[in-house]
């Protein structure tokens, strides 16, 4: 015999109390595929979180992070606070990347700066906290007595992704 | 040398999802950046994220967002790229590039891989 | 994001011209400009980085100049293995990207 159930569409559930009936529903709850008994709670995106996407009866609502967080983990769980460029977030705030490397984004770590000879080549642009070197030709492609490096473009606002 | 093979062609049905594979060779896979990249027929090419292959740290372009999702593989050198509810407007051919010494710009290019979504 | 106005979008030149395109992005991106090839085959291969900087390989008619929204790219004596499409990308921030090509003809 087949389940009555499985008729419900998504946006519905299977009402037991109502002989096993599809109601539609309740408000601020949802289902996102059919033969559902229950609805599940909408997310409510309070706080640090913000409404990026609104519950509707078939979909759940979506959450970003307000201006100075950025999301982390599935679905964004979790906001976390942005840091400068050239910044990486410590369990006592923002810290100022270490010399020798850098973070070009408000978000993550502070990375090494690339190791240009692992490819051979020299630096063309030194690093500096809010961007990498860039690396430049081999050494011997240089023209003799050619300056190799130089000095840093001026730090600009980042690109960068929140996620 | 440096080389980047990617996965062979894909025709896809709309709503499915398709995962595209990109592997390195020759160089310190985990030191550099993997990017990807979309050319849709006659079209340009748009930036869809990257991921430092190290820690498997990502950063989106936000218009793919909730279309990508991109991951690494240290163990076998592999970058992969998920494209999810797939619909015809993500016909294209996929490229993975790496960037050169930091990362700026992409000096290798893989062949690409074309998806085809069609019913 | 930073629009890439590439100019112009096709352009046709015998063998021996010299060749320019331009690109604009909406903002300054200091020098973190790179150019690209795309053959018909769609090989892409990187030909300028940092605005002027000439990928090691690259044969020296092709150069790059300019700086924060203002650049240009040059085939200083065109070859018929040049027929390719060529785009410029900026890395200077999040999202990366592309100007929408030119498409290059020998006449």
């Known amino acids: 015999l087949q389940d009555p159930c499985s008729n419900c569409p998504a946006g519905t559930f299977c009402d037991n109390n109502r002989n096993q009936i599809c109601s539609p529903c309740p408000p601020n709850s949802f289902s996102s595929a059919g033969g559902q008994r229950t609805c599940d709670i909408c997310r409510q995106c309070k706080g640090v979180f913000r409404t990026r996407k609104e519950c509707s009866s078939t979909s759940n609502a979506e959450c970003d992070c307000t201006p100075g967080f950025h999301c982390l983990g599935a679905g964004c769980s979790m906001c976390e606070q942005d840091c400068k460029q050239g910044q990486e977030l410590t369990k006592k705030g923002c810290k100022d990347c270490c010399f020798g490397t850098f973070n070009d984004q408000k978000r993550g770590i502070c990375r090494p700066w690339t190791n240009c000879s692992l490819d051979g080549k020299s630096v063309l642009v030194n690093g500096t906290k809010e961007r990498d070197v860039v690396c430049g030709p081999s050494p011997a492609d240089l023209s003799p007595g050619a300056s190799s490096v130089t000095p840093p473009a001026p730090a600009r606002e980042p690109g960068h992704s929140p996620q | 040398q440096v080389q980047l093979v990617q996965s062979g062609a894909e025709v896809k049905k709309p709503g499915a999802s398709v995962k595209v594979s990109c592997k390195a060779s020759g160089y310190t896979f985990t030191s550099y950046w993997i990017n990807w990249v979309k050319q849709a027929p006659g079209q340009g090419l748009e930036w869809i994220g990257n991921?430092?292959?190290?820690?498997?740290?990502?950063n989106y372009n936000q218009k793919f967002k909730d279309k990508a999702t991109i991951t690494a593989d240290k163990s076998t050198s592999t970058a992969y790229m998920e494209l999810s509810s797939l619909r015809s407007e993500d016909t294209a051919v996929y490229y993975c590039t790496r960037d050169y010494g930091s990362s700026y710009s992409f000096d290798y290019w893989g062949q690409g891989t074309t998806v085809t979504v069609s019913s | 994001d930073i629009q890439m106005t590439q100019s112009p979008s096709s352009l046709s030149a015998s063998v021996g011209d010299r060749v320019t395109i331009t690109c604009r992005p909406s903002?300054?991106?200091?020098?973190?400009l790179n150019w690209y090839q795309q053959k018909p085959d769609g090989t892409v291969k990187l030909l300028i980085y940092?605005?002027?900087r000439l990928r090691s390989g690259v044969p020296s008619r092709f150069s790059g100049s300019g700086s924060g929204t203002d650049f240009t790219f040059t085939i200083s004596s065109l070859q018929p293995e040049d027929i390719a499409t060529y785009f410029c990308q900026q890395g200077d921030t999040l999202p990366y990207t592309f100007g929408q090509g030119t498409k290059l003809e020998i006449k």
């Open positions: 991921i430092y292959p190290s820690d498997s740290y990502t």
């Open positions: 940092y605005t002027s």
């Open positions: 903002q300054d991106i200091s020098n973190y």
